[in-house]
């Protein structure tokens, strides 16, 4: 009579997530008499996958009939697979008996399940920098299987250098996460530039998932100020204009001041955008300068998102 | 706890039916046959036929071909056994059995039986 | 289809007696065959399976032995709560067949 073997022929199997796994397992005898059970891991902390005998298994089912007789077929078929079904399975052949006595495993089939990255997020800095400054954008994602992932970084489609990537943990997991920070140095011209975050893996066959962070919210024009005098009209009335040019956001807050004291204030809104993102605007203020003795010192004094107000002023001279 | 629970007794008429069911708990049930054997009164186990809870496939012996059907509803764990054309010779208590083919080739488990009369 | 004949179909015997009962399929089946108790008005029940293997939760008292076509049964000691009706059973191959029963009464 030959000794019993339990054969399990694939040493691995690899399923992408949401497939099923079949795990072959074959007896070279019907001898002696007992069932059939499988178990993920070895040792006392092993886990039942399937036993023919008793239990509830709803995502396993025999790949042959066990009730038919002569059937030395004790595959399994294990549906909709998550990484967290990775691990190495065991097919153990028992003596009945009371209780059942281990007889014989299979060697152990390796099951590892790949799974797609998690569509990449990206986050900015939480507060913005002006031009020439370096920021740090922040790209993650999760979930995937295998290891091995390549991230890449794009400011409006020029690859960049400057950032670190992690890939956790370190050791053997179900699953992985990646994490990448990459630096970015902030120019004027930036309001519409885009970073992307690119992940390609195995298991999207050549298509990388991206994840984009627009400039925008990461990046704080300052305003230029200008402030010029009109002609004098012919009711003494001189107009001053304040030109606030090149900003971003559009957040502002105008003050005139005349001599020291609050003449206006104005908020800008629904402001045209120029090519580059930025706005402009422009502020006027009359003066009567038949009503001051003395020059009118005038200051226009700009509040940008919540920044340090920025002052310029102008002397009106009043003839005598 | 393992079990099968077998329906209520019958009395049938002759040329009537009658659908016996078995009702498994506490394992696996796709994973064993279920037989069913009869016993008449005084007389020695009968085996009728078999069915896989697995597949539904099925096997019937010889003398009862054509009379018999055997089904099972996996939703619920339930063996049914319907027989035909009643005589009186089909008076007896129907048993269900669990049988496990590729590993163990016996009856370890038993319904209590369902007794059929069959009179006119 | 296999034939199992079982000899005696009854035997009287006494608390303490050792009792053999046979069975003789009409063709080789291997280890395939079973012993089953029976009493009045209950289900058969498991005793050896796979001709020589005690069932869980039965006394040692029972034993099985044979292979191909010759089985034996056998009570070493018997005991009060043992008079009852046994059967072998053939598990070889389709139509499963049962022996015809050996009643075993007291003396």
């Known amino acids: 009579e030959e000794e019993l073997q339990v054969i399990q022929p694939e040493k691995s199997v690899s399923v992408a997530a949401g497939e099923s796994a079949t795990l072959n397992c074959t007896a070279t005898s019907l001898i002696p008499v007992g069932p059939i059970q499988w178990f993920r891991g070895v040792g006392p902390g092993r886990e039942l996958i399937y036993s023919q005998k008793e239990g509830h298994f709803p995502r396993v089912t025999p790949v042959s009939d066990p009730t038919k007789r002569n059937n030395m077929d004790f595959s399994i078929r294990i549906s909709n697979i998550t990484p967290a079904d990775a691990g190495t399975y065991y097919c153990v052949k028992f003596r009945k008996g009371s209780p059942d006595v281990e007889l014989k495993s299979g060697a152990g089939t390796e099951l590892s399940v790949r799974a797609k990255p998690s569509a990449p997020v990206v986050s900015g800095p939480a507060v913005r920098a002006t031009a020439e400054h370096t920021v740090s954008f922040t790209c993650e994602s999760h979930g995937f299987s295998p290891r091995d992932i390549t991230l890449k970084w794009f400011k409006n489609g020029n690859e960049l250098s400057d950032f670190q990537t992690n890939v956790d943990p370190a050791g053997k997991s179900v699953s992985y996460s990646i994490r990448s920070t990459a630096r970015v140095v902030l120019t004027r011209r930036d309001v519409h530039s885009q970073v992307i975050c690119e992940v390609a893996h195995v298991t999207l066959q050549g298509d990388p998932l991206r994840g984009t962070a627009n400039l925008s919210e990461a990046i704080r024009v300052p305003p230029f100020l200008e402030v010029t005098q009109q002609s004098m009209r012919a009711d003494n009335q001189v107009n001053v204009t304040c030109q606030v040019t090149k900003f971003y956001p559009q957040r502002l807050q105008l003050t005139w001041l005349e001599n020291g004291n609050v003449s206006r204030t104005e908020m800008a809104s629904a402001l045209p955008e120029n090519k580059d993102g930025t706005y402009n605007w422009t502020s006027w203020l009359l003066v009567n300068v038949s009503a001051h003795r003395d020059d009118v010192k005038l200051t226009c004094q700009v509040e940008h998102d919540g920044q340090p107000a920025v002052n310029k002023s102008f002397s009106v001279k009043v003839s005598a | 706890q393992v079990q099968l629970v077998q329906s209520g007794a019958e009395v049938k008429k002759p040329g009537a039916s009658v659908k016996v069911s078995c009702k498994a708990s506490?394992?696996?049930?796709?994973?064993?046959?279920i037989s069913w054997v009869r016993q008449a009164p005084g007389q020695g186990l009968e085996w009728m036929g078999w069915?896989?809870?697995?597949?539904?496939?099925?096997n019937y012996a010889q003398k009862l071909q054509g009379r018999v059907t055997m089904t099972t509803d996996t939703s619920t764990s339930t063996a049914y056994m319907e027989l035909r054309s009643l005589r009186s010779d089909d008076t007896a208590v129907y048993y269900c059995?669990?049988?496990?083919?590729?590993?163990?080739?016996?009856?370890?488990?038993w319904g209590r039986g369902t007794l059929v009369t069959v009179s006119s | 289809d296999i034939q199992m004949t079982q000899s005696p179909s009854s035997v009287s015997a006494s608390v303490g007696d050792r009792v053999t009962i046979t069975c003789r399929a009409s063709?080789?089946?291997?280890?395939?065959l079973a012993w089953y108790q029976q009493k009045p008005g209950k289900a058969p029940k498991l005793l050896i399976y796979?001709?020589?293997n005690l069932q869980s939760g039965v006394p040692s008292r029972f034993s099985g032995s044979g292979s191909g076509t010759d089985f034996t049964l056998t009570i070493s000691s018997l005991q009060p709560e043992d008079f009852a009706t046994y059967y072998c059973?053939?598990?070889?191959?389709?139509?499963?067949?049962f022996g015809g029963g050996t009643k075993v009464e007291i003396k």
């Open positions: 796979a001709a020589s």
């Open positions: 059973q053939q598990g070889a191959s389709f139509p499963i067949t």
């Open positions: 059995a669990r049988e496990a083919g590729s590993s163990w080739y016996d009856f370890d488990l």
């Open positions: 506490g394992y696996t049930f796709h994973g064993y046959g």
């Open positions: 063709q080789g089946i291997s280890s395939w």
């Open positions: 069915i896989s809870a697995y597949s539904g496939e099925t």
